[in-house]
Interface confidence: low
């Protein structure tokens, strides 16, 4: 049966899937508020452009009957459930916002002909790469693998003079949705990361990880894991760590490292943290202690999704183009729009680009300091601290294989 799009004659709607299974445990009313705040900004921008149109959101709530675990691992059917609701209501907006779970998004793509754009705050997995009408507003796993390969190969920086080609990956299956798919991408034998490494082993048990820290026969000095400092401490505690071990802690959606009064705990000295730049407006601010950084990023992605919808609406209306065409559905990529925190760039496949930041713990100040930044848009590493006060010998990152001799 034909679903009519509420997307013409001066009235434009975005359908927002409100799913109990979401990438981050954010109350749905907060997501709704983020959407509404975004709509207000969009209305103002359209009005300023002289476009006298109505913009609204319709919220589609799932009943959670089939899938009540509340996490993304049980979300495969939920997106389709909601699509069925839309189909029964015979009403659809110009754009679909959601779902955020990789399983849901993948399944919806598999089972439906999506002739309208879909915007997701999540869908991190490789299986959601290269989808022609999907836009992802939080860094997908593919971007992480590009950074890691780029960084592994780098050997011409004062603090990194060896190319690396080996790694351990710690993945115990209890990770958050973003970490689950980031590590999944590193584990997958077909991924870019696996393809470029000569040795990679996934550690699945706490004991495996703990043993590697002092194992003289280890095959790599580098361990990649995902989560926050507390997660690492639970695993590592105050155990001794060999001096040439480097732990890469992926913690993209966490601004706590940039707080003025944060001191790095001692167990972080062998760790490089990969996070994202919180933006200029936030770098100099004093964060309150009760900041919930992941929720901030998730809600911000929803708000930016609405702003993206507004941007595309404005562009098409100003050019006198039809909104309900395949051209509109495929247009949400290869562009920059004004997000809530500044410009947001989407790549050729509709995935958000960002500045990733690699931090180290200064042995002098016990503060997190920026070692380098990485621009995902141009796949380029930019060193920031040319003389880092590392814990590692000679203030240089060690070779990834101990005593391999000169290269």
């Amino acid at each position: 049966s034909q679903v009519s799009q509420n997307c013409h004659n001066g009235s434009y709607e975005i359908s927002v899937l409100m799913m109990d299974n979401s990438a981050f445990a954010e109350p749905l009313e907060n997501v709704e508020d983020a959407v509404n705040e975004g709509l207000e900004i969009v209305r103002g921008r359209l009005q300023n452009a002289g476009l006298n149109v109505t913009v609204n959101a319709s919220f589609m709530y799932s009943d959670g009957l089939i899938h009540n675990s509340g996490d993304c691992r049980s979300s495969t059917c939920e997106g389709l459930d909601l699509l069925r609701k839309i189909s029964n209501a015979k009403r659809m907006g110009c754009v679909l916002m959601g779902p955020s779970c990789t399983y849901s998004t993948f399944q919806m793509y598999l089972d439906t002909e999506l002739s309208y754009p879909m915007i997701s705050a999540g869908s991190f997995g490789l299986s959601c790469d290269y989808k022609e009408t999907l836009t992802r507003l939080m860094s997908p796993a593919r971007k992480l693998t590009y950074f890691l390969v780029n960084f592994w190969k780098t050997n011409d920086l004062p603090f990194k003079t060896y190319s690396w080609s080996t790694s351990y990956v710690y993945k115990n299956g209890t990770e958050s949705e973003d970490c689950f798919w980031y590590l999944n991408a590193l584990e997958a034998s077909v991924s870019y990361f696996s393809h470029e490494l000569s040795f990679k082993l996934v550690l699945r048990q706490d004991k495996e990880f703990q043993d590697i820290l002092m194992d003289h026969n280890r095959k790599s000095n580098v361990i990649v894991m995902c989560g926050g400092p507390e997660f690492l401490y639970k695993l590592k505690g105050d155990r001794a760590v060999a001096e040439d071990i480097v732990i890469i802690l992926v913690d993209l959606f966490n601004d706590q490292y940039f707080e003025d009064n944060v001191t790095a705990p001692d167990y972080m000295k062998n760790v490089l943290v990969l996070t994202q730049s919180p933006g200029n407006s936030l770098l100099n601010s004093s964060f309150s202690r009760n900041l919930s950084p992941t929720k901030r990023d998730f809600a911000l992605a929803y708000l930016n999704g609405i702003l993206l919808f507004g941007h595309m609406l404005k562009t098409f209306l100003e050019n006198g183009e039809n909104i309900t065409t395949p051209k509109f559905a495929h247009a949400f990529r290869n562009l920059t729009f004004e997000g809530y925190d500044g410009p947001v760039t989407l790549d050729d496949w509709g995935d958000v680009d960002s500045t990733m930041v690699l931090l180290y713990t200064s042995v002098d100040t016990k503060k997190y300091k920026v070692l380098l930044t990485y621009d995902t848009h141009v796949n380029q590493t930019n060193p920031v601290d040319m003389s880092p006060t590392f814990t590692w010998k000679n203030s240089k990152l060690p070779n990834d294989i101990t005593d391999r001799g000169p290269q």
Epitope: E37, E40, L282, F287, N290, S292
Partner: nanobody, 133 residues
Framework: QVHLVESGGGVVQPGRSLRLSCAAS????????RGWFRQAPGKEREGVAT???????SYADSVKGRFTISQDNSKNTLYLQMNSLRAEDTAVYFC???????????????????????????WGQGTTVTVSS
């Protein structure tokens, strides 16, 4: 820290109008909202009106239809137009700013004057409004 300075208070007769202003300076970053609060003698501070960055206004029931909050982002100034003033409006009026540092910075419900937690908010020194015949 944002520096907020209120002005426009004074003594006024019931039924008359008054306009308060609040000039913000210093680091403002990305804010959730700004608002006006008041504290009558011997009472707790209460929300009067708030306005989000995009201009959505919310009012306490006691002032709805009488007070109007507005802002001029280019001048970094907040206003409160108070009409049909009553004796019970007598209080010290404070300007406040809730910034993105707040945990739920994206939740405009948090910005409603009835629900706004007072933690993580920057305050002005206050300006006194006395409604008396």
């Amino acid at each position: 820290q944002v520096h907020l300075v209120e002005s426009g208070g004074g003594v006024v007769q019931p039924g008359r109008s008054l306009r308060l202003s609040c000039a913000a300076s210093g680091y403002t970053g990305r804010r959730l909202c700004r608002g006006w609060f008041r504290q009558a003698p011997g009472k707790e501070r209460e929300g009067v009106a708030t306005i989000t960055l995009s201009g959505r206004a919310s009012y306490a029931d006691s002032v709805k239809g009488r007070f109007t909050i507005s802002q001029d982002n280019s001048k970094n100034t907040l206003y409160l137009q108070m009409n049909s003033l009553r004796a019970e409006d007598t209080a010290v009026y404070f300007c406040a700013e809730v910034r993105s540092a707040d945990a739920e910075w994206l939740n405009p419900l948090k910005c409603h004057p009835d629900r706004l937690g007072l933690a993580g908010v920057d305050w002005g020194q206050g300006t006194t409004v006395t409604v008396s015949s």
